[in-house]
Amino acid sequence: SETTTGTSSNSSQSTSNSGLAPNPTNATTKAAG
């Protein structure tokens, strides 16, 4: 899978956590963006 980020980044973020993708695990199915 592929995600492109730019001026309108749609990273989902909670109030306190970073919006970056968490470290991969074997259950990971796609890169977050």
Partner: antibody, heavy 118, light 107 residues
Framework: EVQLQQSGPELVKPGASVKISCKAS????????MNWVKQSPEKSLEWIGE????????TYNQKFRAKATLTVDRSSSTAYMQLKSLTSEDSAVYYC???????????WGQGTTLIVSS | DVQITQSPSYLAAFPGETITINCRAS??????LAWYQEKPGKTNNLLIY???TLQSGIPSRFSGSGTGTDFTLTISSLEPEDFAMYYC?????????FGAGTKLELK
């Protein structure tokens, strides 16, 4: 000891493509995203994108979407970045860097210098 | 994209002095700012992440502060090996973005 060993300098002609490698050791290669960063005198540091070593899933900076392609070879714990349709503006130092969710870009390769010139 | 404004771009100091470098984000990045040191012939070194957390192995004379949009890197009692380039970088959202850098030179 975590190490990211990048391939050597490249001198290529405008319009050509180049593929830079980054061999990881000293940590679980599949446990962390591999990121790529461009450093040029004009623009300082620019994030190109990242790849999930398990799935091959990628996230790109929109600016580099048409320029860079990120891949991995899990069997050799190596990440690759291909740059295409090269111009003089692509002349820069390119870094691979391991991203940990908590600490961000915690280990960097030594950099690969790319010169695009006819 | 989150724009990061880093200042000053150049700083000269004596060993033993305390210096500060500032980064301002164009919008809130919560606590998610990292600081890096760049020296010729060495790989880039992560100093601080999440605004104020010292990376393992980094001397305690390095400290970071700030949340939201304004952040500061402080180096207390400068050592000769601290004269280098410093960059900040937000790790709150994609695309990751960096400050333009601060060159710390020996006065």
């Amino acid at each position: 000891e975590v190490q990211l060993q990048q391939s050597g300098p490249e001198l290529v002609k405008p319009g050509a493509s180049v593929k830079i490698s980054c061999k990881a050791s000293g940590y679980s290669f599949t446990g962390y995203y591999m990121n790529w960063v461009k450093q040029s005198p004009e623009k300082s540091l620019e994030w190109i994108g990242e790849i999930n070593p398990i799935t091959g899933g990628t996230t790109y900076n929109q600016k580099f979407r048409a320029k860079a392609t990120l891949t991995v070879d899990r069997s050799s714990s190596t990440a690759y970045m291909q740059l295409k349709s090269l111009t003089s503006e692509d002349s820069a130092v390119y870094y691979c860097t391991k991203r940990d969710y908590d600490t961000s870009l915690d280990y960097w390769g030594q950099g690969t210098t790319l010169i695009v010139s006819s | 994209d989150v724009q990061i404004t880093q200042s000053p771009s150049y700083l000269a100091a004596f060993p033993g002095e305390t210096i500060t470098i500032n980064c301002r984000a164009s919008k809130s990045i919560k606590k998610y700012l990292a600081w890096y040191q760049e020296k010729p012939g060495k790989t880039n070194n992560l100093l601080i992440y999440s605004g104020s957390t010292l990376q393992s192995g980094i001397p305690s004379r390095f400290s970071g502060s700030g949340t939201g949009t304004d952040f500061t890197l402080t180096i207390s009692s400068l050592e000769p090996e601290d004269f280098a380039m410093y960059y900040c970088q937000q790790h709150n959202e994609y695309p990751l973005t960096f400050g333009a850098g601060t060159k710390l030179e020996l006065k």
